[in-house]
């Protein structure tokens, strides 16, 4: 049925970038400026997205594809297809309802977007803090305290033979 219908439907011959113009005996007319059709057989063209205000044009609207927007400097995209622009903050900050706020002690953010995240807890991995964390940087974990004790070899000893039935850590 679909095949029969498409053979009879003159609109199915209209390629992307055109629309099936009922006012002109179903002839395929080009999409007018500031509109597009991304698929064939369409009876109307869609209006192009306008990148205004905090948005800026990344790619113009063509007859077959919508415009692509980006955010002006100082803002970054959020959502599918950059549907929103969110204010950038400095590294070491996060965006709150009251604007950009410094990360609390024990957290960091190394980007201009996103939230402050807790410093890595080195002791959970049996390691020690080699470099302290800041608002902008995570801590750097170093060898475990035992590895740093006097008399400890600086050469890594060979790994012990793995016991059967134990999975690697």
């Amino acid at each position: 049925f679909e095949r029969t219908r498409s053979l009879q439907d003159p609109c199915s011959n209209c390629p992307a970038g055109t629309f099936c113009d009922n006012n002109r005996n179903q002839i395929c007319s080009p999409c007018p400026p500031n509109s597009f059709s991304s698929a064939g057989g369409q009876r109307t063209c869609d209006i192009c997205r306008q990148c205004k205000g905090v948005f800026r044009t990344r790619k113009e609207c063509s007859s077959t594809s919508n415009a692509e927007c980006d955010c002006t400097p100082g803002f970054h995209c959020l959502g599918a297809g950059c549907s929103m622009c969110e204010q950038d903050c400095k590294q070491g900050q996060e965006l709150t309802k009251k604007g950009c706020k410094d990360c609390c002690f024990g957290t960091f953010n190394d980007q201009k977007r996103g939230i402050c995240r807790p410093w890595t807890n080195c002791s959970l991995d049996g390691k020690s803090v080699l470099v302290n964390g800041t608002k902008e940087r995570d801590v750097v974990c170093g060898p475990s305290p035992a590895d740093l004790s006097p008399g400890a070899s600086s050469v890594t000893p060979p790994a012990p033979a793995r016991e059967p039935g134990h999975s690697p850590q």
Epitope: G17, T18, P30, C31, R56, T57, R58, K59, C61, S63
Partner: antibody
Framework: SVEESGGRLVTPGTPLTLTCTVS????????MIWVRQAPGEGLEYIGF?????FTYYASWAKGRFIISRTSTTVDLKMTSLTVADTATYFC????????????WGPGTLVTVSS | DVVMTQTPASVSEPVGGAVTIKCQAS??????LAWYQQKPGQPPKLLIY???TLASGVSSRFKGSGSGTEFTLTISDLECADAATYYC??????????????FGGGTEVVVK
């Protein structure tokens, strides 16, 4: 209006920057385009900087040509010039938010010869 | 790359006659095509864009049509001032920041 400048006789390998100066409209509201035409030949689309400040280049021009802008000028920086780059270089404004050039400058001639 | 093949290379018609110029794209470009007129020693002039939209200040004697890969420029009621070279040009985006906004080879129109 649109007007190009900076065209001159250079030797192969010499870098050259062309400048497009506009008046009567705001550059950052339009696509600003560079096109060239070798003597007696057809038109060749080089690339453009769009209203958002993003640059696009023809595949043959990418890496050798750089388009940039200020509030009143658009530059075309050209490197590794060869005799084949001898042409009149046109700057133009895009029509209606597109990269179709509609307002053209008179062009500036670049001659590359040893 | 998108190749634009323009025919004929040259055409001669009398005043009051009509000229048809064809442009074929090597792949579908929707309706992203423009037509330009260029006279010796002058920059090109945009006549038509989006395949059929007349540019500002251009005579309605110029008519563009077509979509996909086949496009036509028709100049009716020819005048001496129409003697020029005519170019088609597509808009086509590749990957990243590469474009294939290719011009056709041009058609010289002689008005007798």
């Amino acid at each position: 209006s649109v007007e190009e400048s900076g065209g001159r006789l250079v030797t192969p390998g010499t870098p050259l920057t062309l400048t497009c100066t506009v008046s009567g409209f705001t550059i950052n509201s339009y696509h600003m385009i560079w096109v060239r035409q070798a003597p007696g030949e057809g038109l060749e689309y080089i690339g453009f900087i769009n209203d958002g400040g993003f640059t696009y280049y023809a595949s043959w021009a990418k890496g050798r040509f750089i388009i940039s802008r200020t509030s009143t000028t658009v530059d075309l920086k050209m490197t590794s010039l060869t005799v084949a780059d001898t042409a009149t270089y046109f700057c133009a404004r895009g029509v209606d938010g597109t990269s179709y050039p509609d307002l053209w400058g008179p062009g500036t001639l670049v001659t590359v010869s040893s | 790359d998108v190749v634009m093949t323009q025919t004929p290379a040259s055409v001669s018609e009398p005043v009051g006659g009509a000229v048809t110029i064809k442009c074929q794209a090597s792949q579908s470009i929707g309706s992203d095509l423009a037509w330009y007129q260029q006279k010796p020693g002058q920059p090109p002039k945009l006549l038509i864009y989006r395949a059929s939209t007349l540019a500002s200040g251009v005579s309605s004697r110029f008519k563009g049509s077509g979509s996909g890969t086949e496009f036509t420029l028709t100049i009716s009621d020819l005048e001496c001032a129409d003697a020029a070279t005519y170019y088609c040009q597509c808009i086509y985006y590749g990957s990243d920041d590469v474009i294939y906004h290719t011009f056709g080879g041009g058609t010289e129109v002689v008005v007798k």
